[in-house]
Interface confidence: low
């Protein structure tokens, strides 16, 4: 499932190339392993901004699919309780390109520990 999430992220990267979206997104670029689930939820929350800003049906569908895949993968890990993690809005704001790169990085963390 996480591999499919990366495929969707690459698809989103390709789709936004031709668009001018100047939104900045809360991005965790240095994910601590003990906060990776919390960080992933922030990424999923912010991903909706891309869908919203683009106004593009293909991006919307890909984002929706990615969120479902990620949720299924998260729930297969069971209910993980993390403490002392940053809230989404405490994170640094980055452009979409940097956001997507960091998103791929955190997904790779999940792949490496699954």
């Amino acid at each position: 499932n996480w591999v499919n999430v990366i495929s969707d992220l690459k698809k989103i990267e390709d789709l936004i190339q031709s668009m001018h979206i100047d939104a900045t997104l809360y991005t965790e670029s240095d994910v601590h392993p003990s906060c990776k689930v919390t960080a992933m939820k922030c990424f999923l929350l912010e991903l909706q901004v891309i869908s919203l800003e683009s106004g593009d049906a293909s991006i919307h569908d890909t984002v929706e699919n990615l969120i479902i895949l990620a949720n299924n993968s998260l729930s297969s890990n069971g209910n993980v309780t993390e403490s002392g993690c940053k809230e989404c809005e405490e994170l640094e704001e980055k452009n979409i390109k940097e956001f997507l790169q960091s998103f791929v990085h955190i997904v790779q963390m999940f792949i490496n520990t699954s």
Partner: antibody, heavy 118, light 105 residues
Framework: EVQLVQSGAEVKKPGESLKISCKVS????????IGWVRQMPGKGLEYMGI????????RYSPSFQGQVTISADKSISTAYLQWSSLKASDTAMYYC???????????WGQGTLVTVSS | EIVLTQSPGTLSLSPGREATLSCRAS???????LAWYQQKPGQAPRLLIY???RRATGIPDRFSGSGSGTDFTLTISRLEPEDFAVYYC????????FGQGTKLE
């Protein structure tokens, strides 16, 4: 069409337990958070807590921590709010709402009126 | 915990007038995480504005939101009879808080 349909009004006695429900349709239940909001008679909105049905991660407002339990059943796309021992001060309208873009509450249930009286 | 204070508590205006509702936060709030809701008697709240200035689906353009940091404003440019209701601001995101409400009558 996104819909959140809440269970019907309840009349209970102090000390009794209660579980009210919020059945959602029109979107993937695990994709969005579901929040609960209390509105006491003639008063404003009070945030109680929120659940992420994808993995049942639950966050409570400090004011409601330990007072209520929020849960969800993915198999039937339903969120719940429950009390183990009701008090008269729990008399209120309770709303469930979907955490949409950036998690604001974009769709709301119609509300469940809970009356606790001896 | 962030506290949101709305003013005025009650605003009395006539149809056709402009209404300006204020929401002040006890500490800085990202504008991405500030919303406004409308609630009419006997009804559930309805989302009007999110991200401080974005109108929710189906909301008329006479409703607009603005502000940043600790001060946010909801403006209704030309009041219609159906706009008389209670309005709430909300800070959302990973934690949530509502203001106490402004009654527009």
């Amino acid at each position: 069409e996104v819909q959140l349909v809440q269970s019907g009004a309840e009349v209970k006695k102090p000390g009794e337990s209660l579980k009210i429900s919020c059945k959602v349709s029109g979107y993937f239940f695990t994709t969005y958070w579901i929040g609960w909001v209390r509105q006491m008679p003639g008063k404003g909105l009070e945030y109680m807590g929120i659940i992420y049905p994808g993995d049942s991660d639950t966050r409570y407002s400090p004011s409601f921590q330990g007072q209520v339990t929020i849960s969800a059943d993915k198999s039937i796309s339903t969120a719940y709010l429950q009390w183990s021992s009701l008090k008269a001060s729990d008399t209120a309208m309770y709303y469930c709402a979907r955490g949409g873009n950036w998690n604001c509450f974009d769709y709301w249930g119609q509300g469940t009126l809970v009356t606790v009286s001896s | 915990e962030i506290v949101l204070t709305q003013s005025p508590g009650t605003l009395s205006l006539s149809p056709g007038r402009e209404a300006t509702l204020s929401c002040r936060a006890s500490q800085s709030v990202s504008s991405s995480y500030l919303a406004w809701y409308q609630q009419k008697p006997g009804q559930a709240p309805r989302l009007l504005i999110y991200g401080a200035s974005r109108r929710a689906t189906g909301i008329p353009d006479r409703f607009s939101g603005s502000g940043s940091g600790t001060d946010f404003t909801l403006t209704i440019s030309r009041l219609e009879p159906e706009d008389f209701a209670v309005y709430y601001c909300q800070r959302y995101g990973s934690s949530h808080t509502f203001g106490q409400g402004t009654k527009l009558e």
